[in-house]
Interface confidence: medium
């Protein structure tokens, strides 16, 4: 059986788009789950992994390796 | 059970602006983007923009762009979208809503808010 | 931005009717189409997504189809429950955009 594009697994019900954009960053593996991007985390592979020590309370990054800090907190890793 | 719970209803002036809330429970908030789309009445459905809360990373409708702000706060797992300069046109209910799993589109929603603009 | 049109926007029907409506996007969505429910002073109903697979607790009745830029819903034996306003969306890329509607009505 060949599948429609996107389509995966016994029945053609697993559905998988690969994608790199806001919504996700992650290709399809050959049962049609998602595997993340170098940098890319979460079930929609849309959580950035931030620069390693950045504080989980103080610290946040929209780009995987940043380190943005909130108001009132500074350094490397807003520690 | 995926939850949002949205603020109350609000009656605006033209030219101000209001921002409504809306409050997730019973999943990992930073998983998942929340969206925002409105329906004026007797309109249909309008996406407004969207926002990543683990990393602040937010799209938007051109339509609306420069005029509305999506924020969300991780410590309280709540979203919110402010709409400004308000005009009678922008009086619509609007609502949260999120992606479900394995690539849904919108299969949760909040109650909705109305937002009414007059003088 | 892909636009998305569907017709009818209203429709008179009976219960027990077979009722189709369509919605054609501006460019290939890719099956990445859904359809929802929305009645009177409620939040809208996934009925659908990726143009076939029904949604959790959804009756067989509803059924879609299509590809590249057309897509159809089929209600296949209408219920007096059936009654209400439905929607496409694409979600293929942002701006996620809905179609204006089809408010289907008891004849």
């Known amino acids: 059986v060949t599948c429609d594009d996107y389509y995966y697994g016994f029945g053609c019900n697993k559905f998988c788009r690969p994608r790199d954009d806001f919504f996700g960053h992650y290709a399809c593996d050959q049962n049609g789950n998602k595997t993340c991007m170098e940098g890319w985390m979460g079930p929609e592979c849309n959580r950035a992994i931030c620069r390693q020590g950045c504080s989980p309370k103080h610290g946040s990054c929209k780009l995987p390796g940043d380190c943005r800090c909130q108001y009132g907190w500074q350094g490397l890793y807003c520690d | 059970q995926v939850q949002l719970v949205q603020s109350g209803a609000e009656v605006k002036k033209p030219g101000s602006s209001v921002k409504v809330s809306c409050k997730a429970s019973?999943?990992?908030?930073?998983?998942?983007?929340m969206h925002w789309v409105r329906q004026a009445p007797g309109q249909g459905l309008e996406w407004m923009g969207a926002?990543?809360?683990?990393?602040?990373?937010?799209a938007y409708a051109q339509k609306f762009q420069g005029r509305v702000t999506i924020t969300a706060d991780k410590s309280t797992s709540t979203a919110y979208m402010e709409l400004s300069s308000l005009r009678s046109e922008d009086t619509a209910v609007y609502y949260c809503?999120?992606?479900?799993?394995?690539?849904?589109?919108?299969?949760?929603w909040g109650q909705g808010t109305l937002v009414t603009v007059s003088s | 931005d892909i636009q998305m049109t569907q017709s009818p926007s209203s429709l008179s029907a009976s219960v027990g009717d077979r009722v189709t409506i369509t919605c054609r996007a501006s460019g290939n969505i890719h099956n990445y189409l859904a359809w929802y429910q929305q009645k009177p002073g409620k939040a809208p109903k996934l009925l659908i997504y990726n143009a076939k697979t029904l949604a959790d607790d959804v009756p067989s009745r509803f059924s879609g189809s299509g590809s590249g830029t057309d897509y159809t819903l089929t209600i296949s034996s209408l219920q007096p429950e059936d009654f209400a306003t439905y929607y496409c969306q694409h979600f293929w890329s942002a701006p996620w955009t809905f179609g204006g509607g089809t408010k289907l009505e008891i004849k």
């Open positions: 926002i990543q809360p683990g990393g602040g990373g937010t």
């Open positions: 019973g999943y990992t908030f930073t998983d998942y983007e």
């Open positions: 809503t999120r992606r479900g799993y394995d690539d849904y589109p919108f299969a949760y």
